[in-house]
Each structure stands twice: as C-alpha cells, then as structure tokens.
Interface confidence: low
C-alpha cells in the first residue's frame, strides 16, 4: 500500500468507529531506529487533528485522549520534529463517529404497471454518518425469497428487478429492510401485500375526443389502458380555470360520454386508472389532452344603444352601438352582426351584415316611425334580435332625471347620481347612463359608452374607458315606453389645473365694445372639465392690477364681448382657463386699442 507507516504506528482504542460522545485514546509510537538522528530524547512527536496541532511529547511515544469528536470522519496524523529539519509524517488514523441505524420506517412497495418491477422505499431515520448497508428482503409463496443490497450513502430505495404477475392476485408477499453498520443493526416492521395492493397501473394513453355531428352535447372521450384496469377517474376543466370537474367510472373499457361541456371552450382532460375497487393505488394522471368544443348558436341578446343627430330639415343621422356578447353567450366566433332597419308604417326594411365593428351609422328621413333589430351570428346560427324603436330620447321634459351630479370615485371611476323625474317616477322602466369624451365640435367619431340601470336605482358607478384628466359628457336617460327624458353633466375622475390658457386668435371692434375670439385648449391640456374662462386686460404700460371678466365654460362658445375699455388706450389682453383644481397659466397676450370716440 502507498504511504504505509514505515517509521511508526498510530493505534486507536477502543475502535476506529465510535459512537457519538465516546472518548478515544490515540497512541503514536516510533519504530526502532526511526527517531531523530543524534539523540532520541530530542524526538518531538506531534499529533495533528487534520491540520491543527492538538498535542506533542518528547520521546518514543505519545498518548492522547480525545473527546467531543463531531459526527463524520476525523483524520489524525502523527509527525516527528527533529532539530534543524522539517517535520516528518510518521503515521495517521481516521476515526469515524456515528450512530447505530434507527429502525427503517414506512416501508412501502410498488410495481409500476403490470409489466413493471417491484421497488420499495423507506425512511432511513437520522443519518448514521457511517458506512451503512441496507438489505431488502422479499418473501413470497412457496418459500420464494429475493434479496437486494444497497450501499449508497443515502439508501432509501431498492428495485428488486422482479415482476409480480396476476396469476394468483391474492397471494401474500412480505418485504422487510435491515440496516447494518459497525455500531449496530435495525430492521423495519414487515410489510405484507398482494399483487393487487402494490401494482400501480401505468397512466392511460392515446387519449382522444369525438364530437358526434359536431355537437358539444354528444361528446365521447376515448383512451387506452392496461388490461386489468377496472376503475377510471376523469378530470377536465376549461383551460383558463383552476377548478377540475371530476367523474369516477367503473368498467369504462376506454370510453366515456361527457354531457356538461360548454360550447366553443378549450378544455384540458386527464384520466387515471386503478385495478381494484378498494385495493391498490391510482395511476398517475395521464398526459393532458387539450381540445376545443364545437360552436353552438349564440344565446342571449345584444345590448344596443343609439344616438340621433339632426342633419337638416328632412334628414337625421342614426348611429347604432352594441356590446359584444360574453364568451358564454357568443358560444363561438361571431362572424358578423345583422342590422335590420325598418320603417314601421310603410314596411320598408333594409338589412346589412356588419363585420369587424360594433357600430353602424346611417342617414334616414326625419319623418316616419323607425325601428332597428340587431343580432349576432356565428357558424351555427344567430342570437335572438334586439329590437329598438328609434325615438327622440330627450323629448319628454317631465321624464328628465333631476339633480344629476358626477363625482370622482377613486382612480378612474365616476359616480353619477340623480333624482327620479318629476313625472310619476314609477313610470320609469329603466335608466341609461351614457358617457363619451368631451370634444369641442361634438365629434361623432368619439366612442360612446353606456350602462343600463334598474328603475329603482338613482346612481351608477362608471369605470369602463374612463381616463384620468379627461372630461366626459355624461347623460342620464329615463326611458318609459316610447318616451324618454334626459339630463346631462360634465364629469371627470381626476383633474388638475389646465396646462395652458386659451389662445386669443382675434379681437374685433363692434360699436364701442370689443369681441374676443379664442381657440379651445387642446383636450390633452385641459386636464379635466373646464369650469370657467377668464379674460384679463390692463393698460399696456401700467403697473396696476389687471381687470378680469369670468365666463362660465360652454362647450360651443369661443368668443365673448367686453365693453368696458376706454377708446384710444392700448390694452394688453390674455386668457386663462379653470378646472375645479385651479387656474391655468396665461395664454398668449394680445394688444388692442379701441378706436371709438371718448365719452
């Protein structure tokens, strides 16, 4: 052997392998004529624990009692130090500190699949820190025994490599595991089982789904199983759900009809198998099958709203809007919307298919009674049409909701409240709250939003398509039969002072007064709903405070007269805008001198 102890020996008593907490005596002794060259009294024997010096002695031998050694392996090396020379290694010893094995617990055996092999697992208990051998023994009928040994450092699993067969499924087998090391041994309690107890079937494979006549109500799941499988459990869920539907079936023979699937929904399916009603264990779940169920014709009805706009004495523009059906109502991909417009007295009707939009605009005569019907179509059919009679939604003044207010309610929400109309409130069938971004000039391309509210409600929280620092025109409609009344208000969810003031674009003189015209502040700089404009003026070279005139904000207004200027005096004029949060900075300054006569 390499590095044999030529110069001396290290002995360890009582043993190289000791129980945790034990004491050992280590002796280092020199062989004859292996000491220092001149004088043996100069021999200095030094004992190292790994690289640390723990003891020394002058002479031919050294004794050391060592306690408190940690679990695991500790290396002791004895060296000789002579005067004027390096230390020389004499010999060494390893001491192994550990514990006897605990009784292995929870021994359990399994055979994966009818063609698999028997493998057992157990809990070792605490680490022994010593070389520990595990022996697994299996005994069966007719005095058959199998044995397997395991020498891995963390051994808690062994495969016998034998296959139990179903010829005698009730035959008993007994397994036992024994752990042995230098400090002791321990055996598990025996585990007794039959073929049916330990065979865990392979998960089902080759899973398929069929929809008879492309109908979700006629759906069959197919799969393949090992031959002895008696029970299956199926689980399935929409791909976007975390909750499984579970079905247990007996003697399914690789097929099962599913009756409660939703149309046009991607599902995930998994299957597990078992050999016996109350013996053995379920297989792992199969790999997932993902499949989309077929479409069915839409259910539910579209939520439709409309806007009327006067064009001239004989024509009006009708804009129809509708909301997408929910996924559960659409039950498929909506291919188009069918809009039918009909004049009720004359019977004239026109139908149009709309693709890719949820709105439609047309021009109709101002005379006659008009109605629309809108439905949604997928590959299997159409939803029931929503019918609406076109009326003047704000005609009935007595139906107008009263005391409408709009207040910010948290981030990007506006709470709209109102009082019922003066006319018999019980006549109201529903309220509709409508909102759209306020654009000077009443741009009809601005998206329209609405929600419906029960007749007993007097408030609604609007949150859809609400942005901070944008002003919304909000209308509340009360509908009763073929009549409607409305009230409107401006509102925002969040506001601050406008970023700029109005830009004065012209000042003109008219009969001793002036007319100031301005450009609206760009919407993105208004920072909420404008409440007022202010026009300031002062004499050009004066240090006096400016005079001001405050004008309530009206959407369409962009000019205002001022008649308090002195003739032949040059004035500087500018404007600001105000929201509830404060006043903007100045807009541009303009100079003007009134030419009229002095009083």
């Amino acid at each position: 052997k390499i590095d044999a102890c030529k110069r001396g020996d290290v002995t360890v008593k009582p043993s190289h392998v000791i129980l945790l907490g034990s004491t050992v005596n280590i002796t280092c002794s020199l062989k004859p004529r292996q000491g220092c060259f001149h004088y043996s009294r100069r021999n200095k024997l030094i004992l190292y624990k790994f690289d640390r010096r723990i003891n020394f002695h002058h002479g031919h031998s050294l004794n050391s009692q060592v306690t408190g050694l940690p679990l695991g392996t500790t290396l002791f090396v004895c060296k000789l130090a002579c005067i004027n020379s390096d230390e020389i290694q004499i010999c060494g010893a390893e001491i192994f500190v550990g514990v006897a094995p605990e009784q292995p617990q929870n021994l359990s055996c399994i055979q994966k699949g009818e063609q698999g092999t028997v493998a057992c697992t157990w809990e070792r208990g605490r680490d022994t820190h010593l070389y520990t051998e595990y022996t697994l023994q299996l005994s069966g009928p007719k005095n058959l025994t199998w044995q397997k040994q395991c020498k891995d450092i963390y051994c808690d699993y062994l495969d016998f490599g034998i296959n139990l067969t179903p010829e005698s499924p009730e035959s008993n087998f007994t397994a036992k595991v024994t752990a042995v090391n230098s400090l002791g041994s321990s055996s598990s309690l025996p585990s007794t089982f039959t073929f049916l107890d330990i065979v865990r079937p392979l998960p089902p494979w080759d899973i398929r789904i069929k929809f008879q006549k492309a109908s979700v109500s006629r759906c069959t799941l197919y799969w393949r199983d090992e031959g002895l499988v008696l029970l299956n459990r199926l689980r399935y869920r929409p791909s976007n759900s975390r909750l499984w539907n579970m079905v247990n079936v007996t003697k399914a023979k690789g097929r099962h009809d599913l009756l409660d699937l939703k149309p046009f929904t991607e599902y995930e399916f998994q299957i597990s198998s078992k050999l016996h009603l109350y013996k053995g264990s379920w297989s792992d779940w199969s790999e997932s099958l993902r499949a989309q169920t077929p479409e069915e014709e839409p259910t539910g009805m579209l939520d439709v709203w409309y806007m009327k706009r006067h064009i001239d004495y004989s024509r009006q523009q009708i804009s129809l809007f509708w909301k997408n059906l929910s996924v559960s109502e659409a039950r498929g991909k909506i291919l188009h919307y069918q809009v039918t417009l009909q004049e009720l007295t004359g019977g004239k009707a026109m139908t149009q298919n709309i693709t890719g939009h949820t709105s439609w605009t047309t021009v109709i005569p101002r005379t006659g009674n008009w109605a629309v019907a809108v439905s949604a179509a997928n590959s299997k059919g159409s939803s029931l049409p929503t019918r609406i009679n076109i009326m003047n939604l704000c005609e009935a003044g007595l139906l107008a909701p009263r005391q409408v207010s709009a207040n910010s309610e948290g981030m990007d929400n506006i709470l709209v409240t109102w009082q019922p109309p003066r006319k018999d409130p019980s006549a109201v069938q529903e309220y509709v709250v409508e909102w759209r971004e306020l654009h000077p000039g009443g741009d009809t391309q601005v998206p329209l939003n609405w929600l419906r509210s029960r007749p007993y409600n007097v408030s609604a929280l609007i949150s859809e398509n609400i942005k901070s620092y944008i002003c919304y025109e909000i209308r509340v409609y009360a509908l009763s039969g073929d009549q409607g009344g409305c009230s409107s208000i401006l509102g925002n969810s969040k506001h601050k002072a406008p970023l700029s003031g109005p830009h004065i674009n012209a000042i003109t003189e008219e009969k001793g007064s002036i007319l100031i015209s301005w450009n609206s502040i760009p919407v993105q700089e208004q920072m909420g709903c404008l409440l007022h404009y202010r026009i300031y003026w002062k004499e050009r070279d004066s240090n006096s405070q400016p005079q001001l005139c405050e004008i309530p904000y009206r959407v369409s207004q962009n000019s205002h007269p001022i008649n308090s200027l002195q003739p032949r005096v040059t004035y500087v004029l500018w404007m600001t805008a105000l929201t509830a949060a404060g006043e903007s900075s100045h807009g541009n300054e303009r100079e003007f001198c009134l030419q009229g006569k002095a009083n």
Epitope: D3, A4, V17, T73, L75, E94, L130, Y131, K151, D152
Partner: nanobody
Framework: QVQLEESGGGLVQAGGSLRLSCAAS????????VGWFRQAPGKEREFVGR????????YYADSVEGRFTISRDNAKNTVYLQMNSLKPEDTAVYYC????????????????WGQGTQVTVSS
C-alpha cells in the same frame, strides 16, 4: 479493476483557478469513493479531500476548505477538483485515488491510484 487518469494541471498565477479531472475506466466506478491527494517536492503526500459514491457527501482538509470543491458525474465516470483562490503553497503533484469503502481519508487505505498531474502556482 479501475484505472484512473488525472488531467487539467498546469501553471497558474496566485489567486487564479484550475479544474482537475479524474477519469476512470470500469463500469462500477459509481460505487467507489474518490479522494484527491497532493505531494509537494520533498514533502509527504497529503490528503486534500474526498467525495462519496453518490456525490452527496464531501470532506476537505482544513487547508483547502472553502477554496476547493469536489464533484462527480457518474454518467461520465469522472470526478472533478475545482481549485479557486490558488496560493503558491498549493503547488504539488495532484493524485486521485479510488476505493470501495467510503470512510477513508488516509492515502494508504485507497486501492486504486492515478499517475498524477502537476499544478504550479506562481506568485
């Protein structure tokens, strides 16, 4: 019967790193504990560290603890000694050794040995 062959030695500056490999022939190599040893000129062979069969447990000499790491890849029948923060006193011939009994540190207990690979650390 197991044959061992070390590789990866060479010249490196103080503070640098090297990775030594110990390749084994023989199908049952995964059952063996493997130890690394080194021998500097004029000195005794000293224990560096060792790794159990599965790689689950390692021991190191105090002088290399925290700087050297031993690992193994049983699929490739190879054990590695990763040496970081090298010092001039780490200069030596490095040997790997293998044995079936896992509680061994001293070189005389190892049955199979490689030929060694030279590692030189310059200051």
């Amino acid at each position: 019967q197991v044959q061992l062959e070390e590789s990866g030695g060479g010249l490196v500056q103080a503070g640098g790193s090297l990775r030594l490999s110990c390749a084994a022939s023989g199908r049952t190599f995964s059952s063996y504990v493997v130890g690394w040893f080194r021998q500097a000129p004029g000195k005794e062979r000293e224990f560096v560290g060792r790794i159990s069969w599965s790689g689950a447990r390692t021991y190191y000499a105090d002088s290399v603890e925290g700087r050297f790491t031993i690992s193994r890849d049983n699929a490739k029948n190879t054990v590695y000694l990763q040496m970081n923060s090298l010092k001039p006193e780490d200069t030596a011939v490095y040997y790997c050794a293998a044995d079936l009994k896992w509680e061994v540190l001293l070189s005389e207990h190892y049955e199979y040995w490689g030929q060694g690979t030279q590692v030189t650390v310059s200051s």
